[in-house]
């Protein structure tokens, strides 16, 4: 099931999904001056089964002036460089995304795509946070967030990460006390069913990732 909203925003941090759960959608969006080709797809969808998943449909953009161009070329390096994503461009790719059953890899760029990718995640998706360049992480717990289904509604767990400037003290003015659990309350307080599909495999993946993602200085 689709998560109703996006993962939480952490000041001075970005998040990335290392792989996208089957059912994830990616909007087909184009950068300024370009639009989707006529009869072009509105979104890409990660489809498949537990053994093999792939992105269905392709996003294609064309110049607003010439609506009938349909060429799809891999962007030049300078075009790729300008694209901003809500994911972390980590110096190393810590996990072989293909090794996760029921998940899709990061879709390759398409020509003239928008500067920001907008994904719509599904229940069970896990994303990982990293402080942006110039900030360092203060961990109070896992720097990750999971989309869960609780009481028939979706919500993202709260990542336990604070990003502080190198020159600053670790205590922010007005900083809240550390929370008891990633969700902001002990799990025992809630008695209803929590859907935790794929948590085991993603937690194992996170364990193998933690050293490479979060101890590598972001250059």
């Amino acid at each position: 099931e689709l998560c109703d909203d996006d993962p939480p925003e952490i000041p001075h941090a970005t998040f990335k999904a290392m792989a996208y759960k089957e059912g994830t959608m990616l909007n087909c969006e184009c950068k300024r001056g370009f639009r989707r080709i006529k009869s072009g797809s509105l979104y890409m969808l990660c489809t498949g089964n537990s053994s093999h998943s792939s992105w269905d449909n392709q996003c294609q953009c064309t110049s607003s002036a010439t609506r009938n161009t349909t060429k799809q070329v891999t962007p030049q390096p300078e075009e790729q460089k300008e694209r901003k994503t809500t994911e972390m461009q980590s110096p190393m790719q810590p996990v072989d995304q293909a090794s996760l059953p029921g998940h899709c890899r990061e879709p390759p760029p398409w020509e003239n795509e928008a500067t920001e990718r907008i994904y719509h995640f599904v229940v069970g998706q896990m994303v990982y946070y990293q402080c942006v360049q110039g900030y360092r992480a203060l961990h109070r717990g896992p720097a990750e967030s999971v989309c869960k289904m609780t009481h028939g509604k979706t919500r993202w767990t709260q990542p336990q990460l604070i990003c502080t400037g190198e020159m600053e003290t670790s205590q922010f003015p007005g900083e809240e006390k550390p929370q008891a659990s990633p969700e902001g309350r002990p799990e025992s307080e809630t008695s209803c069913l929590v859907t935790t599909t794929d948590f085991q495999i993603q937690t194992e993946m996170a364990a193998t990732m933690e050293t490479s993602i979060f101890t590598t200085e972001y250059q």
Partner: antibody, heavy 115, light 107 residues
Amino acid sequence: DVQLQESGAELAKPGASVKMSCKASGYTFTRFWMHWVKQRPGQGLEWIGYINPSTDYTEYNQKFKDKATLTADKSSSTAYMQLSSLTSEDSAVYYCARGTVVDYWGQGATVTVSS
Amino acid sequence: DIQMTQTTSSLSASLGDRVTISCRASQDISNYLNWYQQKSDGTVKLLIYYTSRLHSGVPSRFSGSGSGTDYSLTISNLEQEDIATYFCQQGNTLPPTFGGGTKLEMK
């Protein structure tokens, strides 16, 4: 909870314009497209267009290109649709609806065009 | 534009019945087919997207199937609250287009 609250019913004269609003709450407004859909009494649904509130990028159904103008105000998480040069054909219920697969809809706003 | 056709404009059924509503596209829409429910008060809800994916909060008695140009919505065990009009919609390409609707009534 995701909610889309549309402005109230409008009564307008032929040739006039109306601007209706759709106030979004319960989600990050800029991360979801906002669509507008028309439904004439006793008839089906017609897609008018959508706006990406993050970039103000719009796409319109060719049929409504000269009729509707979509805008969004990020600061108030509100989407707007202006209908111009109204005729009796524009009398309908108009819905705002969010998302890539259009997953949540407003309650609908009735526009009546009459002299 | 892609035309969406719901050949049955109204359908009568009894509580507990299994009801199937069909929808046909004028060209292949690659499973990008959504189903909506509209109640008599005008409220519209997404039931199913991408042919068979249940939207959150939708009862499991609703299911969808199909491929290519032919799609269907099935209500396995009709309940009173299911009395409504059902629309299919293709979300593959712009402009998204809707079927004419199938009004479900109680016998």
